[in-house]
Interface confidence: medium
């Protein structure tokens, strides 16, 4: 098994067991030792080994560290002399006692955690052991503590979440690979509360969004919508412009590894019969001789419940992409769970997914990140083989993706039905543009123009920012009674005609409100078209209207250069 | 930022005690950890002890083992190292350090003081 340096593994043909010492070794004779041969190594031998791979700076195949760490039976000594990454797969009970157990986890905090997937044995008894050790009791964690857990704190479960969030949000912010259920719920939580490091969701800026990064995808709906709507759109477009968060490009199988596994034969008695936990003892080039394609084909739902590291799924993919050149069935597909990730968008290109329990099953991997390349291609795939965007659809995307509909172009919304437009929540509609929502408001007003007036307004309200002017007048009608924050987000050119008495009407309660909006738009441009007295009568201050004796002339261009109405005066 | 600062560095008799203090001020929550070092005309620095806030589990370099007792006052933000049967090769200047981490590493240490002198004459 070839490393990250890039050397090649030389056959040991049984070296190990008889050099006139093992450090003598060559980078290479050590880098493609076989478990099969360490198994027959004394425990000195072993150690010996372990030793001379961590002063060649050696980096080896996590089915090798496996194996080296089940054969050093006894606590090592020197543990600073060993590969920094075996001490991971290491029992922290043999080193007990608060001498012994400092040692080793000053070192272990230092390893690249992430060799084990999150669900890995290995990897789920370091966490408790490292807090015993460092002496945490309860779940208050200072910044300290912390630091000292290295990569063991993305592993912190939610209660630690919850009573430290202040000195751990920032540290899952950096966490690679996806947090789990508890700690997303968690996370949402203590956002939400708006307390240290971020403040209320109402008080943050760009660099606060910056600042969240990794945790952004955990943010419910009910927080994004308390962010200012502003900040949102200035962070998306310089989100969208910075290729810093651009996600790389899953791995697909390099050309290396192709030649590294074909034609090896399946040593005997290791045939798979099933696929169940005995192959994550499986190097890649058994799991590619020893596992039918057929098999794992059929078996695709077991494939989750197994911990396989990733270079494994990588070898389950590349059966199944020899299996499917054309594209996987969508039986398959459905059950590919987490090997989704692995998926390019070429991959995906190839598949017809007509089932919706498909794609929920697929969004459901995704579930708590942002929209990848990915999913992306999988919904286009899906909604084009669908023909249009229909109310089921609808429904489950936007439950996986809030801001699904507004992510579509103008052009791609008109291919949506009046009939699917009942699915839309408010919050589905956060992120839209004047131009999306001028295409959604006239589906609306047909989708609900059989409710009554009260009923109706609720439904409509959330599309209102496509609404015109007309429209607008019919509703000041009605005692709707409109919300501020509703009327800001109407068309500007939709709300210059209307008259105080009509806007007074519209707003009821609310009108109010103008006063503290009286500098933005569009109240500010429709204060302007306001003669001053009829603004007077509404007893709120409102200054800026015209003077009376005046005349408006609707000159309309010399408007459109100055953005105020032409005056003649007395 | 931590501010530390070292004190009770003086000559003392071969076999005498000596007690060194260091005060720690600023913000004291992001570290975890305190270690005192010392560094001999011409040596390197050397490890001593190291004390951590969690538990206040102490842990002592072999050639202090059994005369060296790291303790901490949490009341007035001080560490001390009482050092007993005094050699003259524990001459050297004393420095106290903090920071973050299990405290093997000297990279575990981002904060530290000045020193003081220990001086044991023979």
């Known amino acids: 098994l070839a490393g990250e340096t890039g050397q090649e593994a030389a056959p040991l043909d049984g070296v190990l067991a008889n050099p006139p010492n093992i450090s003598s070794l060559s980078p290479r004779q050590l880098l493609g030792f076989p478990c099969a041969e360490v198994s027959g190594l004394s425990t000195e031998r072993v150690r010996e080994l372990a030793v001379a791979l961590a002063q060649k700076n050696v980096k080896l195949s996590t089915e090798q560290l496996r194996c080296l760490a089940h054969r050093l039976s006894e606590p090592p000594e020197d543990l600073d002399a060993l590969p920094l990454d075996l001490l991971l797969f290491l029992n922290p009970d043999a080193f007990s006692g608060p001498q012994a157990c400092t040692r080793f986890f000053s070192r272990i905090t230092k390893a690249n955690v992430d060799l084990l997937p999150r669900g890995a044995p290995e990897r789920q008894r370091l966490l408790p052991a490292a807090l015993a050790c460092w002496g945490v009791r309860g779940s208050l964690l200072s910044e300290a503590d912390v630091r000292a857990l290295g990569g063991l704190a993305c592993d912190l479960p939610g209660r630690f979440v919850a009573e430290s969030a202040e000195v751990l949000l920032p540290r899952l912010v950096s966490c690679p690979g996806p947090l789990d259920q508890d700690q997303q719920e968690a996370a949402r939580a203590a956002l939400q509360g708006g307390g240290p490091p971020y403040g209320p969701p109402s008080t943050w800026s760009v660099s606060t969004m910056d600042a969240l990064r990794g945790l952004l995808p955990v943010l419910g709906q009910p927080i994004i919508r308390s962010i200012p709507q502003g900040i949102v759109a200035a962070w998306r477009q310089r989100s969208s412009r910075d290729p810093s968060w651009r996600q790389p490009e899953r791995t697909i199988l390099r050309p290396r590894f192709r030649r590294e596994v074909e034609k090896t034969a399946c040593p005997s008695g290791k045939k798979a019969r099933e696929i169940d936990e005995s192959l994550i003892f499986y190097k890649k080039w058994e799991l590619e001789a020893c596992v039918d394609a057929a098999l794992l084909a059929t078996q695709m739902d077991r494939v989750n419940a197994i911990p396989f590291t990733y270079e494994q799924l990588d070898v389950l993919k590349h059966k199944l992409d020899e299996l499917y050149p054309q594209g996987y069935p969508e039986s398959v597909i459905q059950h590919l769970g987490y090997l989704f990730l692995k998926m390019s968008p070429e991959d995906i290109r190839k598949w017809n997914v007509t089932s919706l329990e498909t794609l929920k099953a697929l969004l459901e991997v995704n579930k708590g990140h942002e929209m990848s390349p990915q999913v992306a291609t999988l919904i286009d795939r899906f909604v084009k083989g669908r023909g249009q965007l229909d109310k089921d659809t609808l429904d489950t995307l936007t439950a996986f993706y809030p801001g699904y509909l507004c992510s579509l172009s103008p052009e791609e919304l008109s291919s949506v039905p009046p009939s699917s437009i009942w699915a839309v929540r408010p919050q589905d509609l956060d992120t839209c543009d004047p131009r999306q929502l001028d295409v959604l408001y006239p589906k609306a007003r047909l989708a609900f123009q059989n409710m009554n007036g009260s009923e109706y307004f609720v439904k409509i309200q959330s599309f209102l920012g496509g609404a015109p002017t007309e429209d607008l007048k019919a509703l000041s009608q009605q005692n709707v009674s409109m919300d501020l924050a509703t009327f800001m987000k109407l068309r500007t050119d939709a709300v210059l005609p209307l008259t105080v008495a009509e806007v007074q009407k519209l707003l009821g309660p609310h009108v109010e409100g103008l006063k503290a909006e009286e500098r933005h738009r569009p109240v500010r441009d429709w204060i302007l078209r306001q003669r001053q007295d009829d603004l007077d009568t509404l007893g709120l201050g409102l200054q800026g209207g015209i003077p009376n004796g005046y005349l408006v002339l609707d000159l309309s261009m010399q408007e459109a250069l100055s953005g105020t109405p032409c005056l003649l005066g007395p | 930022q931590v501010h530390l600062v070292e004190a009770g560095g003086g000559l003392v008799q071969a076999g005498g005690s000596l007690r060194v203090s260091c005060a720690i001020s600023g913000r004291t929550d992001s570290t975890g950890i305190l270690g005192w070092f010392r560094r001999a005309p011409g040596k390197e620095r050397e490890f001593v002890a190291l004390?951590?806030?969690?538990?206040?589990?102490?842990w002592y370099e072999d050639s202090a083992k059994g005369r060296f007792t790291i303790s901490r006052d949490n009341a007035k933000n001080t560490v001390y190292l009482q050092m007993n049967s005094l050699k003259p090769e524990d001459t050297a200047v004393y420095y106290c350090?903090?920071?973050?981490?299990?405290?093997?590493?000297?990279?575990?240490?981002?904060?530290w003081g000045q020193g003081t002198q220990v001086t044991v004459s023979g």
């Open positions: 004390i951590r806030w969690s538990n206040n589990y102490a």
């Open positions: 350090a903090a920071g973050t981490g299990w405290g093997f590493s000297i990279s575990d240490y981002n904060y």
